[in-house]
């Protein structure tokens, strides 16, 4: 054995954005012949573990949200830990509104600004484009989030949603905004 074992990957199925009350499975993907898998929930003051390669959460609750990582053991050697997975509970707060300025129909080459507004004094907003697994844009901390999209191209066409949350509870998000369809005309 030379050096640490390669790290596994930790995935959330069907998604790491989980509406309250919905099911989710965390799965640690590594060698099938590993002697032992360990899944940790990394919470300051309450770091906890189970010796499994999966965690099934039948009903997502607020206390399930947070950061997770996993490792495996082979012949008494431990792997490097997986990258941390952020499991986010959505629907904790009511949805923000998402709008496009000057319009959601925009010719190529023009600028459009997507604005996410919450009824709460949240300092974090995130924008998702349908079909993408990662956030499309994440602005700095603004109470009213403007997501500038510069020089619109056909690739910017699509359906967008935003979420809002507080930086003091970064894994508890609002419900998604109603979808906003951006059409690049011409």
């Amino acid at each position: 054995q030379h050096g640490p074992l390669p790290k596994p990957s930790l995935q959330a199925q069907p998604s790491s954005l989980v509406p309250l009350g919905h099911p989710v499975t965390l799965r640690c993907l590594g060698p099938s012949d590993a002697d032992l898998y360990r899944l940790e929930k990394v919470k300051p003051g309450k770091l906890i573990f189970i010796d499994q390669d999966f965690l099934f959460i039948p009903i997502m609750e607020i206390n399930n949200a947070g950061r997770y990582r996993c490792s495996y053991q082979n012949e008494s050697h431990w792997s490097l830990p997986s990258d941390q997975l952020e499991l986010i509970a959505t629907g904790v707060y009511s949805k923000p509104s998402l709008s496009a300025h000057p319009s959601s129909a925009i010719p190529p080459g023009r600028d459009v600004t997507l604005k996410c507004q919450s009824q709460y004094s949240f300092d974090e907003f995130v924008l998702y484009k349908e079909g993408d697994t990662r956030p499309y844009k994440r602005p700095e901390k603004w109470y009213r989030a403007n997501f500038p999209v510069i020089t619109v191209t056909a690739a910017h066409s699509g359906t967008y949603r935003c979420y809002s949350f507080s930086s003091s509870s970064p894994y508890l998000w609002s419900a998604p905004s109603d979808p906003l369809v951006v059409v690049v005309t011409g």
């Epitope: 032992l36 929930k41 300051p44 573990f49 189970i50 010796d51 490792s71 431990w78 830990p81």
Partner: antibody, heavy 123, light 112 residues
């Protein structure tokens, strides 16, 4: 109430063997991780080995790997430490300790300790 | 040599405040693992004093408090009493080999 009682310590010659036992009561033994922790005379605490509730997950400190074997019998509410190829530096009080648990999750700290059993390795 | 570093001894007069430090590394305390503290009175087994960096089990006086920052932690004892004279150990977990690690222990002497 939770109780852990160690036994099996004694005087043994270098290269010899000894088997320690820890009798648990007052809790659902098979649900908990348990560890052996030792303390050489006048020295600090050293974690030795841990075992998961079912007995399939075991871990050892580098200093005892290949010489000590941890096991458990949940039907008897008992934890064991088989110590082979003993050395003078294994002389210590050996404690068994329970890891705290909540729902399905285990914690990395020890909430209950036994009173310890003394192992002396000397010729 | 212990993975976590503690001062070998501290002392204080009755009623005073003392702190005991516990320094680790990026693979244990700095990897997100909590720090726990145990008190060992002379001739007895260790007893859990602080868990999860700053939490006290029931029965532990609020004169004992813990904190964690970065790769280190500390235990504070206020209003020192003669019965606090004991050895104190910090404990955490190490990510590299998934082993439990202790500090070398600190002997607290209550003067006078």
């Amino acid at each position: 109430q939770v109780q852990l009682v160690e036994s099996g310590g004694g005087l043994v010659k270098p290269g010899g063997s000894l088997r320690l036992s820890c009798a648990a009561s007052g809790f659902s033994f098979g649900d908990y991780y348990v560890s052996w922790i030792r303390q050489a005379p006048g020295k600090g605490l050293e974690w030795v080995s841990a075992i998961g509730g079912s007995g399939s997950a075991v871990q050892y400190a580098e200093s005892v790997k290949g010489r000590f074997t941890i096991s458990r019998d949940n039907a008897k509410n008992s934890l064991y430490l088989q110590m082979n190829s003993l050395r003078a530096e294994d002389t210590a009080v050996y404690y068994c300790a329970r890891h705290y648990r909540e729902f399905r999750w285990h914690y990395y700290y020890f909430d209950y300790w036994g009173q310890g059993t003394l192992v002396t390795v000397s010729s | 040599q212990s993975v976590l570093t503690q001062p070998p001894s501290v002392s204080g007069a009755p009623g005073q405040r003392v702190t005991i430090s516990c320094t680790g590394s990026s693979s244990n305390i700095g990897a997100g693992y909590d720090v726990h503290w145990y008190q060992q009175l002379p001739g007895t087994a260790p007893k859990l004093l602080i868990y999860g960096n700053s939490n006290r089990p029931s029965g532990v006086p609020d004169r004992f408090s813990g904190s964690k920052s970065g790769t280190s932690a500390s235990l504070a004892i206020t209003g020192l009493q003669a019965e606090d004279e004991a050895d104190y150990y910090c404990q955490s977990h190490d990510l590299g080999a998934h082993v439990w690690v202790f500090g070398g222990g600190t002997k607290l002497t209550v003067l006078g």
